[in-house]
């Protein structure tokens, strides 16, 4: 007779990351009897929802249900039917919805209301949709990467089970770049966090952490580009904007109404004598870098030191995981290797931006032109943000690790969010630790 496998005693959780440019659904799985162990939760699926971010549905809220269908149906397939009713579903919306809320609380609520009604139609245990704060986004990203790196585990190992592990309990800082905001989160070294808004206290697995975090709204890569265009068109002599952040030969028409649609460009808004203008790429890294630096106000700092725009930033400490768009952009540019110095990254960006647009299109024929056209800007922006914004140096660059996944789970805020909401990170170290996969018997 054939042995029947015992049914796995596992649990599942679903988190939807409703970002400014798109929504992704993540499915997590963990052994039911090891809920309080560190590192046992892992991602089993990521489903990218086709279409833009939910904030773009403000004029067509009736389409939200259809928009979410494919990924929710995928979740239905991946998670065993017997587990559906006890699988929690959370949706967290980030900076795209924060911006919409700044424009209109009513419109933001209307979008979330339809999202909630749509998600309630599935057989899972829907726990609500909300706009998370920038502070939460930073904190949960920090929890995610340190949880996956095993930094909260009190077991010392003579071997490494995860990449980047330095075999100590020193946590990694988290650098997250989205379309509409960017977050920096880390434990400073014996430094008072001078601004209370940027201070977080955690007790995780019996250890206290004093964490610095800040989310820069409007400094995600997409909104930063809108800001730069709005700033530069102010001084353009006509409806042609010669832009160093786009490849030579690149041309694109932009509607002024689209440029001023976002609250991020309000500070640059002016009455222009034209309704449209044309971007003409000239592909010059150095000039692009200079233009981007004008978005960072470094002239004012009410603290001992600042990042930019008068925001306190303690001295950088330890290693950092840079994920989300930091990783996607650098991966595309083939600049994620630990061996590539900051000087080399800059050199490669200079070469990349100077390449003619026709040549770029041929070399990357499979990439959508909308995305392809913006890698020169995005790569330059990442360098500007990390070096001039956050004060990384050529020396400390080696402490930045561009991370897509850790142990098969995406780096990002969603895992930390779920761990927190399902109470899976205990404040105290569990008394007895069951044998885990990293223990030899």
């Amino acid at each position: 007779t054939q042995n029947k496998a015992l049914p796995e005693n596992v649990k599942y959780g679903i988190v939807l990351d409703a970002g400014s440019s798109h929504t992704s659904l993540y499915i997590y799985k963990w052994p039911a009897e090891k809920e309080n162990d560190t590192g046992v939760v892992h991602q089993v699926e990521e489903c990218r929802v086709k279409g833009p971010g939910i904030s773009k549905f403000v004029q067509k809220v009736n389409e939200i249900g259809i928009y979410l269908t494919d990924c929710m149906e995928r979740a239905r397939e991946v998670i065993p039917r017997s587990q559906h009713q006890e699988t929690p579903v959370y949706l967290g919306a980030t900076a795209g919805m924060r911006l919409l809320r700044m424009e209109s609380e009513e419109l933001a609520d209307r979008v979330l209301d339809v999202v909630e009604r749509s998600l309630s139609n599935y057989p899972f245990d829907f726990q609500g949709a909300r706009i998370i704060t920038g502070q939460e986004e930073g904190a949960y990203g920090w929890i995610t990467i340190n949880y996956l790196l095993g930094k909260f585990s009190q077991k010392t190992r003579w071997f490494s089970i995860v990449p980047y592990e330095t075999n100590n309990q020193e946590t990694f800082g988290a650098l997250d770049l989205g379309g509409a905001s960017t977050q920096v989160t880390f434990v400073p070294q014996n430094q008072t966090i001078e601004s209370p808004d940027n201070a977080l206290q955690f007790r995780l697995y019996g250890k206290d952490y004093n964490v610095y975090t800040h989310s820069f709204l409007c400094y995600g890569k997409d909104q930063a580009l809108w800001q730069k265009l709005a700033k530069d068109i102010q001084v353009a002599s006509n409806e042609i904007l010669r832009d160093p952040c786009f490849h030579p030969g690149y041309k694109k028409v932009v509607n002024v109404s689209d440029l001023y649609k976002t609250p991020c460009t309000k500070r640059f808004e002016m009455t222009l004598p034209f309704q449209q203008f044309e971007i003409q790429g000239i592909g010059n890294y150095q000039q692009c870098h200079q233009s981007i630096l004008e978005l960072f106000n470094t002239s004012y700092c009410p603290y001992s030191q600042c990042a930019f725009n008068g925001i306190f930033l303690p001295p950088l400490q330890g290693d950092f995981g840079a994920f989300s768009a930091f990783y996607f952009v650098m991966k595309f540019l083939n600049l994620t290797s630990e061996k590539v110095s900051q000087e080399k990254v800059t050199e490669m960006m200079k070469k990349f931006c100077a390449q003619p647009w026709e040549e770029i299109k041929t070399s990357y024929a499979g990439v959508k032109e909308k995305y392809l056209s913006e890698y020169c800007f995005s790569g330059t922006y990442i360098l500007s943000l990390l070096l001039q914004g956050y004060h990384f140096t050529a020396d400390s660059w080696e402490h930045i690790h561009f991370i897509g996944k850790i142990q098969g789970s995406d780096a990002g805020w969603t895992l930390g969010y779920m761990l927190n909401l399902t109470n899976m990170i205990p404040a105290e170290q569990p008394l007895s630790t069951p044998l885990s996969h990293s223990t030899y018997v």
Partner: antibody, heavy 117, light 110 residues
Framework: EQQLVESGGGLVQPGGSLRLSCAVS????????ISWVRQAPGKGLEYIGI???????YYANWAKGRFTISKDSSKNTVYLQMGSLRAEDMAVYFC???????????WGPGTLVTVSS | DIVMTQSPDSLAVSLGERATINCQSS????????LSWFQQKPGQPPKLLIY???TLESGVPDRFSGSGSGTDFTLTISSLQAEDVAVYYC??????????FGGGTKVEIK
Amino acid sequence: EQQLVESGGGLVQPGGSLRLSCAVSGFSLSKSIISWVRQAPGKGLEYIGIIGSSGSTYYANWAKGRFTISKDSSKNTVYLQMGSLRAEDMAVYFCARGLLYSGNKSWGPGTLVTVSS
Amino acid sequence: DIVMTQSPDSLAVSLGERATINCQSSQSVLLNNQLSWFQQKPGQPPKLLIYDASTLESGVPDRFSGSGSGTDFTLTISSLQAEDVAVYYCLGGYSGNLYAFGGGTKVEIK
């Protein structure tokens, strides 16, 4: 069934202060926008301000500084604190759930504030 | 400051006839369509009739309709009934969580 009821209106002297309450039931304050609107006797509707689901507040330019909106979600109540009251502040004060989309039963009946010496 | 100008101030229309009320905003409303119309009867709070410039609130008779975009909007009562006697207000929603009511239009039977 959702319901909003204003209270706290009455007679106040010029220069005085008053706090109006808006008690809500049938829905969660933590997920709702509440607005305050007033109407002077025989006059039109005038927007005062709103408090968002996250607690953010926004005001009409004329109301900034003198009027403050707050809420206590545990008591299901939103407040309108009014200071330096003048004769022209005499009106019926309404609270509403939302504003542009304030559907059926989304408005309270109103509370009258009289400013007089 | 944003100014919402509503016209006429008052309107007398025969039963069964069409009534038209206009609202003009000093700046474009959010998304060009964030405009609502309210009906208010004496001693009552306002009642929502139309939102998104042209969407009829549920339970509102279809003789009420709204049109317009950007800065110019119209409320039409296609066939005035006795119960439609009231004051009508437009309300615009603007970028930055700003709002402005029109001055109101009193509708009476001729």
